[in-house]
């Protein structure tokens, strides 16, 4: 056959469903390979043809469209199952082809299966909400496109094993689970089980996402350093290790990039000659505020070290701040003999 | 378990049009501590129940008003002693009913107004 | 705003009969609803929340039904006691409120 673009194996979308439940996967090509949707592609000629690989064979083979009650099939660029059986899994290719184009791209399908609790191997999305916000909501996620509008599915929710019947706090409200107010007792697994009707069989997709919650925007200030401070001065000899940490206190702020950083004499410690070393650590807490200590060190101070202006800057999205370190030279203690010698006034 | 009301005072709760009144309920006995709502409901003479509005009992500061309250009550709640409050103001011949508190727990263990206080009779006549 | 409308009232049936009352949301409320049971000079008890789950040391003989706009508790075997209003709760939320709506409440005779 005729070259054809192959764009080989989409690792990056992992796609992972339920067992004995409906899927529909679209053909990644339209959605990360190509300029094209599938309608102008259609309209232009072109075929879409879908084949797999069964897990630990390498034998590519055609995917079985004739199965009892359509099992499988295609609409479009979507392939369905209804619903998938443990040993769909495989990589499956859709290749887009005509007589003069041809593209193809395989991605790896793995079906899940799941206890009574809905605990699985599925890889969890996380939806974060603010501590103490207001009412907030997460969404029962990816259910678009498997019933038509006309259809009203019923939907149950679940922290963990639990389904959730009351409305004194977390409130379901369809596709929507509301929370009066969250609080780090809410931090958990949520599972929404949407039922619907479909040719006279009834199915359910399962949705488990992770909540977690974190510190509110409302709460949220610059970044905070803890030290240095005014109330410890780093005195030292030269020849002895200056360690002289800078810690600083980020509140949580959603897609906030956090910065810790020293300067010395008002230059990046990789600008200068000095040998200088910072090691850093990394703390959250239950909201996830984080807390970075970075410990800068010079194993060998000099007295010429000890002149130096030595800061610690933060900067996060609520800001930037700055605190120099007290750094001084110890004064040596006088020697025991001069100092009993010139008190008693010996010349 | 008990949520016990008190306010009112002497007179049993009698307020002149315009007066303002607070009313308090005392939580005791809850393994739960204070996670949950406190929700305020009133009950005119022969009527039915009415919604004010609800305070979570713990740390965090949150709290709903039906919206025909219009700021005019306030609901507020004393951590430590596990009390919750409600401060009537501008009252009217209308505000007179037996004013209950009830409880609704956090978490997914049991109903809303599992329990509920005893009710305060508030009159407001000149 | 929530409407919770309560039909019929008064109801009337005998001991041992089964009485239904029913309650409208005027808008989806999903299984948000509870069932209260008032007698004269009491405050009300919970009978039943998430529109069909039985309070604890509720009897059996109550039972709820109905999810979205039309629910119903039904009481079957009919006791004396049993003599009181009911009122439903309808819960929903908007974007930064929270409405708790009662029902008018149903008067259940027994004769």
């Known amino acids: 056959s005729e070259r054809c673009d192959d764009w080989g194996l989409d690792t990056m979308r992992q796609i992972q469903v339920f067992e004995d439940e409906p899927a529909r996967i679209k053909c990644p090509l339209f959605e990360h390979f190509l300029k094209f949707n599938y309608s102008t592609a259609h309209s232009a000629g072109l075929t879409l043809i879908w084949y797999w690989t069964r897990q630990d064979r390498d034998l590519e083979e055609p995917i079985n469209f004739r199965l009892p009650e359509n099992r499988i099939s295609k609409e479009k660029d979507v392939l369905w199952f209804r619903p998938t059986l443990l040993n769909d899994t495989g990589n499956y290719t859709c290749m887009l082809r005509n007589t003069t184009y041809c593209s193809k791209v395989a991605f790896p399908l793995e079906v899940v299966q799941k206890d009574s609790c809905f605990n699985s191997p599925m890889k969890l999305p996380v939806h974060k909400l603010y501590i103490e916000y207001g009412i907030q909501r997460i969404t029962c996620p990816n259910v678009d496109g498997y019933f038509p509008s006309s259809v009203k599915p019923t939907i149950t929710w679940y922290m963990g094993c639990y389904k959730i019947q009351n409305f004194n706090n977390v409130i379901p409200e369809g596709m929507n689970l509301s929370f009066l107010i969250a609080l780090i007792s809410n931090n958990g697994n949520y599972t929404c089980v949407v039922t619907y009707p479909e040719n006279g069989r009834t199915f359910h997709l399962t949705r488990t996402l992770t909540v977690k919650v974190v510190g509110s925007p409302k709460n949220a200030v610059p970044p905070v350093i803890h030290s240095p401070n005014d109330h410890v001065v780093y005195e030292k000899e030269p020849g002895e290790e200056l360690l002289i940490p800078c810690t600083v206190y980020f509140s949580f702020l959603m897609d906030s990039r956090n910065e810790v950083w020293w300067t010395i004499d008002g230059k990046k410690p990789d600008d200068i000659t000095i040998d200088v070393t910072i090691n850093e650590s990394i703390s959250h807490s239950r909201t996830e505020d984080e807390t970075r200590t970075q410990i800068l060190s010079i194993k060998k101070v000099t007295s010429e070290d000890l002149k130096r202006s030595y800061v610690c800057h933060a900067r996060s999205a609520k800001g930037e701040v700055a605190k120099a370190a007290k750094v001084k030279q110890k004064v040596p203690a006088p020697r025991y003999t001069v100092e009993l010698a010139c008190g008693f006034g010996a010349t | 378990q008990q949520l016990e009301q008190s306010g009112g005072g002497a007179e049993g709760g009698l307020v002149k049009p315009g007066g303002s009144l607070e009313l308090c309920c005392k939580a005791?006995?809850?393994?739960?501590?204070?996670?949950?709502?406190m929700h305020w409901v009133r009950q005119a003479p022969g009527k039915g129940l009415e919604w004010i509005g609800c305070i979570y009992a713990g740390s965090s500061d949150s709290t709903y008003y039906a919206s025909w309250v219009n700021g005019r009550f306030t609901l507020s709640r004393d951590i430590d002693q596990s009390i919750g409050c409600l401060q009537l103001n501008s009252l009217t011949a209308a505000d007179t009913a037996i004013y209950y508190c009830?409880?609704?727990?956090?978490?997914?263990?049991?109903?809303?107004?599992?329990?509920w206080g005893q009710g305060t009779l508030v009159t407001v006549s000149s | 705003a929530l409407v919770m409308t309560q039909t019929p009232s008064p109801v009337s049936a005998a001991v041992g009969g089964t009485v239904t009352i029913n309650c409208q949301a005027s808008e989806d409320i999903y299984s948000n609803l509870a069932w209260f049971q008032q007698k004269p000079g009491q405050p009300p008890k919970l009978l039943i929340y998430g529109a069909s789950t039985l309070a604890s040391g509720v009897p059996s003989r109550f039972s709820g039904s109905g999810s979205g706009t039309e629910f119903t508790l039904t009481i079957s075997g009919l006791q004396s006691d049993d003599a009181a209003t009911y009122y439903c709760?309808?819960?929903?939320?908007?974007?930064?409120?929270?409405?708790?709506?009662f029902g008018g409440g149903t008067e259940v005779v027994v004769k």
């Open positions: 709760l309808g819960v929903c939320t908007d974007i930064s409120a929270v409405y708790n709506v």
């Open positions: 009830a409880r609704a727990i956090a978490d997914f263990s049991s109903g809303w107004g599992d329990l």
């Open positions: 005791s006995g809850f393994s739960q501590s204070n996670n949950y709502w």
